[in-house]
């Protein structure tokens, strides 16, 4: 054997090295990789050093027996059957309340003949639940509402008015407050007749004092 090179590097079971026929001189870098379904244990990169020894021990290829962590899903919690996700492990995603699951709720780690174990599905998504609209309120008797729709989206406002001769008692505008369920901010108003009693009670009457009576009346009177 030459004394100016590093020792030959062997092939490893269930893997290969590149380059496959390396020069074994100082500075040469050799990378080991594993076949699908196997992972490198140890250092995958070896370098021929000044002293003509390899920088690391020879790695090995070990069968992959678990799935990768499928990760968290925003707006959800997850329940895990085994922390290292071995074959047969399950992960359940439950969306936070107010969110809807799109995809598969439960993932299972399956073994494959060729290649690493794989999840039964990709992680789901949790999408914001649609807010329900408010149901239309009927117009008050002797009044009107606008817009005149059966359903009003969350956040919408409706306005009320009364016919001539009627006054509005309550809120003139009410809002569909977003929520689960969405709800009206106030009860609908009513239209009350604007009575004469009400008219006079709300005003003070000023009476001017008449001048003293005289026997003759001015032509102007």
């Amino acid at each position: 054997p030459r004394n100016d090179t590093c020792p030959e590097l062997p092939e490893i079971p269930n893997g290969w090295k590149s380059p496959s026929q390396p020069e074994l001189v100082h500075g040469t870098v050799v990378t080991y990789q594993c076949y699908p379904g196997y992972q490198v244990v140890g250092s995958s990169v070896l370098m021929c050093q000044w002293d003509l020894t390899w920088s690391e021990d020879l790695p090995s290829c070990q069968r992959v027996t678990s799935c990768h962590d499928p990760g968290d899903v925003e707006h959800s919690r997850r329940l895990i059957s085994s922390p290292k996700f071995p074959v047969g492990a399950t992960v359940q995603y439950i969306c936070d309340q107010g969110f809807v699951l799109m995809g598969s709720s439960i993932l299972t780690c399956h073994d494959r003949q060729a290649g690493s174990p794989k999840w039964s599905d990709r992680a789901p998504k949790c999408l914001l639940e649609q807010l329900k609209p408010c149901h239309g309120l009927s117009a008050p008797e002797n009044g009107a509402r606008s817009p005149e729709k059966q359903l009003h989206p969350a956040g919408a406002t409706i306005h009320f008015s009364c016919a001539p001769g009627y006054v509005l008692k309550g809120q003139a505008s009410i809002k569909c407050v977003p929520g689960h369920p969405s709800h009206w901010s106030d009860p609908p108003p009513i239209c009350r007749a604007a009575s004469l009693d009400g008219f006079y009670n709300s005003r003070s009457l000023d009476v001017a004092k008449a001048p003293a009576a005289s026997s003759t009346l001015d032509a102007a009177h």
């Epitope: 997850r78 895990i80 936070d96 309340q97 689960h180």
Partner: antibody
Framework: EVQLQQSGPELMKPGASVKMSCKAS????????IHWVKQNQGKSLEWIGE????????GYNQKFKGKATLTVDKSSSTAYMELRSLTSEDSAVYYC?????????WGAGTTVTVSS | QIVLTQSPAIMSASPGEKVTMTCSAS?????MHWYQQKSGTSPKRWIY???KLASGVPPRFSGRGSGTSYSLTISSMEAEDAATYYC?????????FGAGTKLEMK
């Protein structure tokens, strides 16, 4: 409807571990997740974690990771919670409950007292 | 985590009186749930999904709210309503409970 039967009260020494049980009867055990909730002397309630009896999946409140270990035995319709390295802070009533986003059914609670 | 603040902490009401207690969240939540607990017993689900009454809950109870502000109302107080009421959300992890409102009979 499901009923949840919890194990009896426990008087424990500081540093010890305690394991309590929650047995379900009256409905399909695997239809619901089982949750554990702590109620301390101040009466506040804290969620510890949950287990899905069907798949054995477990989720914890980060605060109780390392303190509580949840397990389930599907064959006996029983959930378990072990608390380790007990201190006086762990003295409380521990409830199991069933549900998804709220707790429909509650057990009667297991009282744990930690005292030297 | 979301903090739920219940107020008042303690309140008392006369028979027939209308009672309202509130639960305020530190961030917006989608739904609120309420539990009733009487001394020495476990909590009972009382109102769920903000406004739905659990089975067996009298119709004098109601719940409403959205965003960060929720409330439980009893239209006419009765002796059997004296208890502690807790609110709870699960709009993010972990779920949390309020510290409770203790309702006493005058």
């Amino acid at each position: 409807e499901v009923q949840l039967q919890q194990s009896g009260p426990e008087l424990m020494k500081p540093g010890a571990s305690v394991k309590m049980s929650c047995k379900a009867s009256g409905d399909t055990f695997t239809d619901y997740n089982i949750h554990w909730v702590k109620q301390n002397q101040g009466k506040s309630l804290e969620w510890i974690g949950e287990v899905n009896p069907n798949i054995g999946g477990i989720g914890y409140n980060q605060k109780f990771k390392g303190k509580a270990t949840l397990t389930v035995d599907k064959s006996s319709s029983t959930a378990y919670m072990e608390l380790r390295s007990l201190t006086s802070e762990d003295s409380a009533v521990y409830y199991c409950a069933m549900g998804r986003w709220y707790f429909d059914v509650w057990g009667a609670g297991t009282t744990v007292t930690v005292s030297s | 985590q979301i903090v739920l603040t219940q107020s008042p902490a303690i309140m008392s009401a006369s028979p027939g009186e209308k009672v309202t207690m509130t639960c305020s969240a530190s961030s917006s939540v989608s739904y609120m749930h309420w539990y009733q607990q009487k001394s020495g017993t476990s909590p009972k689900r009382w109102i769920y999904d903000t406004s739905k009454l659990a089975s067996g809950v009298p119709p004098r109870f109601s719940g409403r709210g959205s965003g960060t502000s929720y409330s439980l109302t009893i239209s006419s107080m009765e002796a059997e309503d004296a208890a502690t009421y807790y609110c709870q959300h699960w709009s993010s992890n972990p779920p949390t409970f309020g510290a409770g409102t203790k309702l006493e009979m005058k």
